[in-house]
């Protein structure tokens, strides 16, 4: 059996995890891709996914998760902004390819988010201040939709809305970009 390996990332609350998951361009460019969390002993939970078919460079925002699929480069960029301690856990990028198993992209990501002041004088964090401008998205409310489409008859109330509005901005303070280097087996 193939041993699943992990890459560990330690970040502070409020920072951003920025992961780039590489994939084989010819095979998976337009395939639907997803970001999943795996809790101990539980089935993977799909937190966010691209559209079907996946659109090139089209940001999809679900809560604090932003997915961008760069077909030209064969990579899925995943950002989790304003990290919280409870975000700590094991994550993976996957490609849906039914009826086959979801295809996991490289190592799983062990995210450890700790409390603390990031970007303070004397800290060794590469912290910057950024404003990511997220263009309007047409995020599908249901994820994934790779098998049998399910119709939504009611959008969530505004308090739980997860689709960014036109010209909405996500203000990120003390952002640390973590670039994930793909490992080819």
């Amino acid at each position: 059996a193939t041993k699943l390996t992990e890459e560990k990332y330690e970040l502070k609350e409020g920072q951003t995890l920025d992961v780039k998951c590489d994939y084989t361009l010819e095979k998976f460019a337009s395939s639907q891709k997803a970001w999943q969390i795996i809790r101990d002993g539980e089935m993977p939970k799909t937190l966010a996914c691209t559209e079907r078919p996946s659109k090139n460079s089209h940001p999809v925002q679900v809560g604090r998760i932003i997915l961008e699929d760069y077909h030209d480069h064969g990579l899925l960029r995943v950002r989790m902004v304003n990290l919280q301690v409870e975000d700590s856990g094991l994550y993976q990028c996957v490609i849906y390819q039914p009826p086959k198993e979801p295809h996991m992209l490289f190592d799983r990501i062990r995210l450890v988010v700790t409390k603390g002041f990031s970007g303070t004088p004397g800290s060794n964090e590469n912290s910057t201040q950024n404003v990511y401008k997220i263009p309007p998205t047409t995020t599908k409310a249901l994820c994934p939709l790779y098998t049998s489409p399910r119709t939504v008859t009611q959008a969530p109330p505004k308090s739980t809305a997860d689709v960014s509005t036109p010209d909405s901005e996500i203000n990120l303070t003390n952002v640390t970009d973590i670039i994930r280097v793909p490992v080819f087996n």
């Epitope: 539980e42 089935m43 939970k45 098998t147 739980t160």
Partner: antibody, heavy 120, light 113 residues
Framework: QVQLQESGPGLVKPSETLSLTCAVS?????????WAWIRQPPGKGLEWIGS???????YYNPSLKSRVTISVDTSKNQFSLKLSSVTAADTAVYYC?????????????WGQGTLVTVSS | DIVMTQSPDSLAVSLGERATINCKSS????????????LAWYQQKPGQPPKLLIY???TRESGVPDRFSGSGSGTDFTLTISSLQAEDVAVYYC?????????FGGGTKVEIK
């Protein structure tokens, strides 16, 4: 339209093994999603027993784990439940359902259910 | 395990009136990263399996009348039937799918007053 149908003996003797099968139609199990068993004792609430993926990955309720086995047969598009060492407390309506816990977070759709009575 | 507590156990409401069912979880069922509450509501009529009404705490399933609505976040949730109809007489269950084992509330029986 996805439909599920439970089948199996309606009467099981104490200490024996309860065996049920859920036939899925209108959808290929091997295309994804998880598949669950839930039970409901007469006049009582619902209890999740466990779930399985088409690859065979299983997840069980710890309260029943030592006695439960869930398996899948993709060639027949069905999955099965075995509950060993049954007692009268296992008398219930047993339902199968598609488990969307990893996606939308719900069970949908459900089978009609089958009543299993444990009695000598 | 996350314990789901529903209240009241039973509820009698006049036709056309509002029915409100509460569900409280012992731990938060919110995944803050994607802002989703993994909380579902079901309707079960006698002799029938449960029918999904609401998932993600507030998203109505296809085909469910708009008099049914779900609200809440974290640990406190509400299912509201804005104008009770005769066909709404049933037992209603909440369920959490935030962490294993998946657990259900004890149910709330809704009747006509």
């Amino acid at each position: 339209q996805v439909q599920l149908q439970e089948s199996g003996p309606g009467l099981v003797k104490p200490s024996e093994t309860l065996s049920l099968t859920c036939a899925v139609s209108g959808y290929s199990i091997s295309s994804g999603y998880y598949w669950a068993w839930i039970r409901q004792p007469p006049g009582k609430g619902l209890e999740w027993i466990g779930s399985i993926y088409h690859s065979g990955s299983t997840y069980y309720n710890p309260s029943l784990k030592s006695r439960v086995t869930i398996s899948v047969d993709t060639s027949k598009n069905q999955f099965s439940l075995k509950l060993s060492s049954v007692t009268a407390a296992d008398t219930a309506v047993y339902y199968c359902a598609r488990d969307l816990g990893g996606y939308e977070g719900a069970f949908d759709p459900w089978g009609q259910g089958t009543l299993v009575t444990v009695s000598s | 395990d996350i314990v789901m507590t529903q209240s009241p156990d039973s509820l009698a409401v006049s036709l056309g009136e509002r029915a409100t069912i509460n569900c409280k979880s012992s731990q938060s069922v919110l995944y803050s990263s994607n802002n989703k509450n993994y909380l579902a509501w079901y309707q079960q009529k006698p002799g029938q399996p449960p029918k999904l009404l609401i998932y993600w705490a507030s998203t109505r399933e296809s085909g469910v009348p708009d008099r049914f609505s779900g609200s809440g976040s974290g640990t406190d949730f509400t299912l509201t039937i804005s104008s009770l109809q005769a066909e709404d007489v049933a037992v209603y269950y909440c369920q959490q799918l935030a962490s294993f084992p998946w657990t259900f509330g004890g149910g709330t029986k809704v009747e006509i007053k």
